[in-house]
């Protein structure tokens, strides 16, 4: 079901079908017998009740006030009233641009990053059953697409994709042909989202341990969705059954980046685990960042300055 018209201020283009749907629709069905009224007020006219007799262009049914089509003189305030429920809209009908396939004031702007997924789908759920065909235009030139019911573009964005895309739905009502236009101004920008991934904390960490005990080395990074974080060490340590890399944890930051952490667990620490580098690496296509952990026997910790220890 089409959602109700909740926006109190609406701008539409003359000559197109248009509707207002009140937001107590489910309630109205429950109380069929309740009197429901639509009113318009504009300039000198205060609260004129609307009905199909007031204009051949107006249709009332269920929860909807329809205009076939909306015209400049339909500008004004509209009210829906039912018992103690009232909803109000302010409607501004603007002139159609006769020299273009769209009206500049009725354009939705979208910014798409180059190489990111870019999609335009021509849909109109409210008028869906009445639509004969739909065409998609780029800068007012018709695009030849397979589906003439819901033309769609789905691709990775390129700079050449920039432009004005207009979905034009053609529909019949009471023997007349109407069209509804929805235009998007698509701007393609450089990839602005990628950060240089960075590991958090000091680059070199000495960790005091006891032989036979376990240790958990935690590594955290701020990275992009495509980047990876992992532990690296000498090839000879790969077969050590006591070294365990735990599952990565990722949390999205408010800026759309990722905070990732990965734990390397070393159980039953042996001599072979001491004084070797356990490197945590964050890698992207642009480079890597690495921080190192060295396990040091607690008894030997007096030889190392205190500030380099991770406890």
């Amino acid at each position: 079901a089409e959602s109700c018209t909740s926006r109190p201020h609406i701008t539409v283009v003359e000559g197109e079908p248009f509707y207002l749907k009140h937001c107590s629709c489910s309630l109205a069905h429950e109380i069929e017998t309740t009197t429901k009224s639509w009113y318009k007020s504009s300039g000198s006219q205060e609260h004129v009740e609307l009905n199909p007799r007031s204009s051949s262009r107006i249709a009332l049914h269920d929860c909807v006030l329809e205009f076939w089509p909306v015209e400049l003189n339909d500008t004004g305030s509209y009210f829906f009233q039912m018992k103690n429920y009232t909803q109000k809209w302010k409607l501004n009908v603007i002139r159609r641009n006769k020299h273009s396939c769209f009206t500049e004031r009725q354009v939705t702007s979208k910014i798409v990053e180059v190489k990111k997924f870019f999609q335009i789908t021509c849909e109109n759920s409210y008028y869906q059953t009445l639509v004969n065909s739909t065409s998609l235009y780029k800068n007012c030139k018709k695009l030849l697409l397979e589906n003439n019911k819901n033309p769609t573009i789905k691709k990775n964005a390129e700079f050449e994709d920039q432009g004005y895309y207009s979905c034009v739905h053609f529909l019949h009502h009471n023997g007349k042909l109407f069209n509804i236009t929805k235009t998007f101004n698509i701007t393609i920008v450089e990839d602005r989202s990628n950060i240089v991934p960075v590991l958090l904390g000091p680059k070199l960490n000495h960790v005091a341990v006891e032989l036979g005990k376990n240790v958990r080395l935690n590594c955290s990074a701020l990275l992009n969705e495509e980047d990876v974080i992992y532990w690296m060490f000498g090839e000879e340590n790969g077969s050590d059954p006591n070294i365990h890399e735990e599952k990565e944890m990722r949390i999205m930051t408010p800026e759309g980046k990722w905070h990732a952490s990965k734990v390397l667990r070393i159980e039953n620490i042996g001599e072979s685990n001491l004084n070797v580098l356990y490197n945590c690496t964050v890698a992207s296509t642009g480079g890597t960042d690495t921080k190192s952990f060295i396990l040091v026997r607690k008894a030997d910790m007096a030889d190392i300055p205190g500030h380099v220890f991770t406890r």
Partner: nanobody, 110 residues
Amino acid sequence: EVQLVESGGGLVQAGGSLRLSCAVSGSAFSRNVMGWYRQRDLVARIWPGGGTFYADSVKGRFTISRDNAKNTLYLQMNGLKPDDTAVYYCNTVGIPLNAWGQGTQVTVSS
């Protein structure tokens, strides 16, 4: 430019097996540590000398191997679980990543 082409994924019942392959062109494959990534999580890696290491989640079930003559990386996946369902990618380890390939989808049904 390095190209990574992963293949061998598919739909398999829990407990089943799959063998993934990754053909690598345009890089010093034999000198690089290579790895298999589940989405963006490194689950298996192999050193140039053949040493291997696995994430806990796949240890004992997955086996990574490489054929330096064919510039190909493999991942033998046994005892598959529904949790293993993901897109699998291969890439370098320890150096900047190559541009990701298209990956290969592995779906494990229960």
